[in-house]
Interface confidence: medium
């Protein structure tokens, strides 16, 4: 997290706000609900209280405007700048302005007013932008999904550094951004994508370019807004410029940023029995056109060319790949080796000699 220079903050805990005008995109009650919910994000974790005024001067004046709207920080039409807010202080201090050239919604369409407002009110309270891609105060808008919003830990640490903790946090689970060099790190899924490696963990993935050591961290939804926050397995089919992503009983086919029509599909359409609730890992072999799908202690082999599950499957993981354990969290193939991830450990398995040749920490893939 980052606070503003000179640690600008309010010297009182009871703050007022006023909604000066409304966007035509939403009903008045939807707008009021979004702002109330956005303030609650911050009051839940601090001693701050927010009271709405219907007229007069409030600490935080909220308005919608377009282009030049009276503060010499003009908006820019659709997309680009969405909103801005002033840090704590007199006059403009704390005020939040929203660009009415955007389409404001209470859903995933357009820009979600609650999410943008919660971010802007962070500025109104004294938080600058964060470098943590998982933080609400990260400067890039990402719709985080319909489920109950949880303020990330980075933002909690930031706001509490200014105002201290509240009496009781009604939602004490604050998601932490994974630390790639945590020795206990386990991974959810790994796939190549157009020459890069995507390493999934919780609602994030690291993107690793072959010539680089530093992996970039992204929210999965910043790449693919329609995907679930977390995924179970992934593999690339390079000759078709597709990747396949699995979550629960569903899977998606993606071409770059775009989901193919007709997806998601059910994993049972691949020929998996109905009892299989999820795929834990998947890896595709371009030379044979086969894909291994792991679930529980079993492995299936799918023929991607003929779109049929191979006979004699499922088989036990321990029988086909002795020594790697009875589950696979994530897997990928490179230069004749399969890399199996099981908890904080990865096994380098030689296809040619059919045995484990190295055991390494899982996060050595991230150069830790």
């Amino acid at each position: 997290y980052n606070v503003f220079p000179r640690t600008l903050k309010w010297s009182k805990m009871n703050l007022t706000y006023r909604i000066v005008n409304y966007t035509p995109d939403m009903t008045h009650s939807e707008v009021e609900k979004a702002f109330k919910k956005a303030f609650k994000v911050w009051s839940d974790v601090t001693p701050l209280n927010f009271t709405r005024l219907h007229d007069g001067i409030a600490d935080i004046m909220i308005s919608f405007g377009i282009k030049e709207h009276g503060d010499f920080y003009p908006f820019d039409g659709p997309s680009g700048l969405l909103a801005h807010a002033f840090p704590p202080g007199p006059n403009y201090g704390g005020d939040a302005h929203f660009d009415d050239d955007e389409t404001w919604t209470s859903s995933s369409k357009g820009y979600n007013l609650f999410l943008v407002a919660a971010h802007e009110f962070g500025h109104s309270l004294g938080l600058d932008h964060s470098k943590d891609p998982g933080a609400l105060m990260f400067p890039i808008y990402t719709y985080t999904g319909k489920s109950h919003f949880m303020l990330p830990d980075d933002d909690v640490q930031g706001i509490q550094s200014l105002y201290g903790p509240g009496d009781e946090d009604p939602n004490p689970k604050h998601p932490k951004t994974p630390d790639k060099c945590d020795p206990s790190l386990s991974l959810d899924a790994i796939t190549s994508l157009r020459g890069e490696t995507m390493i999934f963990k919780d609602r994030f993935f690291w993107r690793l370019h072959p010539q680089q050591v530093d992996a970039e961290l992204f929210l999965t939804k910043s790449f693919w807004p329609e995907l679930p926050n977390r995924i179970d397995a992934a593999y690339e089919h390079p000759s078709h410029d597709l990747i396949f992503i699995f979550r629960g009983r569903k899977f998606w086919a993606l071409n770059g940023y775009d989901i193919l029509e007709g997806y998601p599909k059910k994993i049972s359409e691949l020929g998996l029995p109905k009892e299989v609730k999820k795929i834990s890992a998947a890896v595709h072999f371009e030379d044979t056109g086969k894909t291994l799908l792991f679930s529980g202690n079993q492995v299936w082999r799918y023929d991607d060319t003929n779109h049929i599950m191979d006979k004699d499957y499922p088989r036990l993981i321990e029988e086909d790949f002795p020594g790697i354990g009875d589950k696979v969290d994530a897997v990928y193939e490179k230069n004749g080796y399969i890399y199996f991830f099981n908890g904080p450990i990865q096994f380098e398995y030689s296809i040619w000699s059919n045995r484990i040749v190295r055991v390494m920490p899982a996060n050595s893939i991230l150069w830790c």
Epitope: D241, Y257, D258, L260, E261
Partner: nanobody, 114 residues
């Protein structure tokens, strides 16, 4: 319905630069990812670069660090700035909106030769 028209191709010497443009008709351009693909004679079409609705970029390994993709939604236009061009970059470059099942331009020829 989105129509795409590429421009900016031509003959350039190795080490030179070109900027391709992709002009889209229709106001929905900003709702689609924008991608550039290329096809060299006798070869398969291959992905070059992509930019998402949220302006996150993605490049083929062979062009990363040399090519830059960008978009200007207010002008309904996408761009591909190509620097340090090599003979192996010679191909017809196609603009795409919305991925493989989306919309395609007719292509513009880029020839890198001394």
């Amino acid at each position: 319905e989105v129509q795409l028209v590429e421009s900016g191709g031509g003959l350039v010497q190795p080490g030179g630069s070109l900027r391709l443009s992709c002009a889209a008709s229709g106001s929905t351009f900003s709702r689609y990812s924008m991608n550039w693909y290329r096809q060299a004679p006798g070869k398969q079409r291959e992905f070059v670069a992509g930019i998402s609705v949220g302006r996150i970029t993605n490049y083929a390994v062979s062009v990363k660090g040399r090519f830059t993709i960008s978009r200007d939604n207010s002008k309904n236009t996408g761009y591909l700035q190509m620097n340090s061009l090599r003979p192996e970059d010679t191909a017809v470059y196609y603009c795409n909106a919305g991925g493989l099942q989306g919309y395609w331009g007719q292509g513009t020829l880029v020839t890198v030769s001394s």
